[in-house]
């Protein structure tokens, strides 16, 4: 028998979609061989309709696709806009159509149930509102209006104009009779339940002259939208539940094996700790719609997600919901990189941020994830140069190394910098990534003076000490501005006594400003790099003052007083309350997104980088 397995029978109705999953043994040959969906003809031949090699027949154009999940040994055929012509016998298989590695699937597309003549069909999702329209003749205007539900051969009264309300519909149904001249009454049912599904009868008057109208109410469980995202990627769930619940608390939950739905995040401030640092619920629009972004997708994030509205911020029957089935593909296009970057107080980190290499011109951003309320991510820096004020002199976004990666450098680290940061662009949102910065015990490897005052017109020499392990690295000095860090000429000055254990291998690289001008005031960085990969940096602020004493000024190694916890807030660099509001670009209309969950380390150039999951920003 064939090792391929799938549904033997699939039945649906016109206009619907089906998603047919076929299973195969995930051997390496099977994983990479062609997958197909074909229709069996009268001659016995099986005509390919869609394949994993990109072929789609004209009959399926724009309404079908085939997605392979090699790590699971499955592939999925999605077919939309079904018509009765799609009914027939099919095969899903591997290799070539005529070989035995296939499974027979019967697809039956029907028209839907037969209804009494003149029946009005109302198709509404569970939790939503329906308005049933009931016409009547003038002579029945003063008479009793009623709505019945047909159950088998009997009719059960649901509501009437004499103020009767069936207990099953209490607090969620109303009958409206318009003013004179309008020969129609309406019944509005809110917060529809699955049990409301069925055939209803409107009635005005009684006896042989009564007016009757049949209404077929189809209450649908929201069909889960299938979402396929890459491992380490990100996903955005767009949730539009309607104006009726615009002012009600919203939530996203994940269905668990016990049939209940665990809250992932809600607008009442609840958030599942498994999503810490990688989830945002954006503010609601006026129409009550909202979206939830999850980055750093893991295999265990797979499952069925529901968004909804309820005052408790969790799933309740009879309230509107939307559903998604999330699949996480392990054969990811998003590169593997560390999820944690470590740095020491006073030191620095260099974070590598991936982006879609096809979008080198896109704007790049870096933001700080904040968990308060629904989560937000105020931008700290962007490639056009904006840097939030309290990060002046210690944060820079560099386009290097390019070709799918940019670099963010943060120095003068304090314990306050620990947290989650997101890399993003204004392009492909699937390449959003999250990295956690951890501040660990230790000393910065690069030593620079804590505070320097230069004299106008004279010469200033700023030393930067680095340990022997950086001797093979390229050393540089650059002048920081909010558009980057402009490299300056510098020189190696041979041994220094700063690192006794390194003796003659200890190194010193100096920056000379000669003569000092007013324009020289500002932040300077000393750093190490290997090619286009940046390692550690150290920052020093240079203040410029009028000449007081003749002679040049040299900041000797002995004056390199950079205590690890010291952060000079000088010349307008002051700590201010972070007033950055959530950037709308984070939630611009977008397709389903993905981010590179594991992130590049702080000291990428460092020789003793640790595991692929964690990397130190300052090696000890």
């Amino acid at each position: 028998k064939s090792p391929v397995f799938g549904p033997q029978e699939v039945s649906s109705v016109e206009g619907n979609s089906v998603s047919i999953k076929c299973y195969y043994p995930p051997t390496s040959v099977n994983r990479h061989t062609r997958k197909y969906w074909c229709r069996k003809g009268a001659s016995g031949r099986c005509i390919t309709l869609v394949s994993s090699e990109g072929y789609v027949s004209s009959n399926y154009a724009g309404r079908a696709n085939l997605t392979n999940f090699p790590e699971n040994g499955t592939f999925v055929v999605n077919i939309a806009q079904l018509s009765r012509d799609d009914s027939g016998h099919y095969k899903c298989g591997l290799g070539i159509n005529s070989r035995g590695l296939s499974f027979d699937v019967s697809l039956e597309v029907s028209q839907g149930p037969e209804l009494p003549n003149g029946t009005e069909v109302y198709t509404v999702d569970v939790g939503r509102t329906v308005t049933i329209k009931c016409p009547f003749k003038t002579e029945n205007a003063p008479k009793t209006k009623a709505l019945y539900k047909k159950i088998g051969q009997t009719s059960v009264l649901v509501i009437d104009s004499r103020n009767y309300v069936n207990p099953n519909y209490k607090d969620r149904i109303r009958l409206r009779i318009p003013g004179t001249g309008q020969l129609i009454f309406t019944v509005v049912i809110d917060r529809l339940r699955l049990s409301d599904h069925g055939l209803y009868l409107c009635q005005a008057g009684d006896g042989s002259n009564r007016d009757e109208k049949n209404a077929d109410l189809q209450v649908l469980e929201p069909e889960p939208e299938l979402v396929y995202e890459d491992l380490r990627g990100s996903v955005t769930f767009h949730c539009a539940l309607g104006l009726e619940v615009a002012n009600v608390a919203k939530f996203l939950c994940r269905v668990n094996s016990r049939e209940t739905c665990d809250v992932v995040i809600n607008t009442l401030g609840k958030r599942d700790s498994a999503f810490e640092g990688r989830i945002l619920l954006n503010p609601q629009d006026k129409d009550g719609s909202f979206s939830v972004v999850i980055t750093g997708l893991r295999k265990e994030d797979e499952g069925r997600y529901l968004c909804g509205a309820h005052s408790d911020g969790q799933l309740q029957e009879g309230w509107p919901i939307q559903a998604w089935q999330l699949f996480v593909n392990e054969e990811s296009t998003i590169p593997r990189s560390p999820t944690v970057v470590k740095g020491v107080a006073g030191g620095s980190v260099a974070v590598l941020c991936p982006y879609n290499p096809k979008e080198s011109q896109s704007l790049k951003y870096w933001c700080l994830w904040e968990g308060a309320q629904n989560g937000r991510c105020p931008l700290l820096v962007e490639s056009q140069g904006l840097v939030q004020e309290q990060y002046e002199g210690r944060l820079s976004l560099l386009q290097e190394p390019g070709n799918g990666t940019f670099t963010v450098i943060l120095n003068q680290l304090t314990t306050q910098d620990a947290g989650f940061y997101w890399c993003l662009t204004n392009g492909d949102t699937r390449w959003r990534t999250t990295v956690e910065i951890k501040i660990i015990e230790g000393e910065p490897n690069l030593k620079v003076p804590g505070n320097v005052t230069a004299v106008l017109g004279e010469t200033l020499n700023i030393p930067c000490h680095f340990p022997c392990k950086f001797s093979s690295y390229e050393k540089y000095w650059c002048k920081w501005s909010n558009t980057g860090c402009q490299t300056l000429p510098s020189q190696d000055e041979g041994p220094s006594e700063a690192f006794v254990n390194c003796d003659e291998n200890s190194r010193l690289v100096s920056l000379t400003l000669n003569p000092v001008t007013r324009a020289d005031e500002g932040w300077y960085w000393c750093g190490v790099k290997q090619g286009h990969f940046y390692g550690e940096t150290a920052a020093v602020y240079v203040a410029v003052e009028e000449k007081k004493v003749a002679g040049s000024r040299y900041v000797s190694p002995a004056k390199a007083d950079a205590a690890p916890d010291e952060k000079v807030l000088d010349s307008g660099v002051r700590e201010i309350e972070n007033k950055a509001i959530q950037d709308p670009r984070l939630f611009a209309e977008e397709k389903v997104v993905a981010d590179t969950g594991d992130q590049a380390g702080g000291s990428r150039a460092s020789v003793d980088s640790s595991s692929s999951e964690e990397q130190g920003g300052s090696s000890k």
């Epitope: 979609s17 999953k21 649908l220 929201p222 269905v255 016990r258 049939e259 739905c261 069925r304 799933l315």
Partner: nanobody, 126 residues
Framework: EVQLVESGGGLVQAGDSLRLSCAAS????????MGWFRQAPGKEREFVAT??????????YYADSVKGRFTISRDNAKNTVYLRMNSLKPEDTAVYYC?????????????????WGQGTLVTVSS
């Protein structure tokens, strides 16, 4: 929590038919996979048939050993799933268990199903 109660088992002759029912109560509207498994004396529990649904679309899966003889169906209004068993054979003798799940990764795998009934015994004599 979902409760599943099976019924319809019994003693029949080879070649006869039986219809098993599985009624789900306490069901939230997220359940959309229900299946039948069976366990013969001294053997492991094995997959028989599963029905998965999404809106008005149904997907029916069968084990090779029952294909063409057994039919799985559901009645949404009654929250009940049925297994119609025709042309029964002595080797179909087993305790039949109903199972339910919210997510269908592979219908044949027991650990996909979080909720199980107590089982109903089907005995087919030759």
């Amino acid at each position: 929590e979902v409760q599943l109660v099976e019924s319809g088992g019994g003693l029949v002759q080879a070649g006869d038919s039986l219809r098993l029912s599985c009624a789900a109560s306490g069901r939230t509207f997220t359940t959309y996979v229900m299946g039948w498994f069976r366990q013969a004396p001294g053997k492991e529990r094995e997959f028989v048939a599963t029905i998965a649904w999404s809106g008005s679309t149904n997907y029916k899966y069968y084990a090779d050993s029952v294909k063409g003889r057994f039919t799985i169906s559901r009645d949404n209004a009654k929250n009940t799933v049925y297994l119609r068993m025709n042309s029964l054979k002595p080797e179909d003798t087993a305790v039949y268990y109903c199972a339910a799940s919210t997510v269908l990764t592979d219908p044949r795998r027991l650990n996909e199903y979080a909720n199980w009934g107590q089982g109903t015994l089907v005995t087919v004599s030759s």
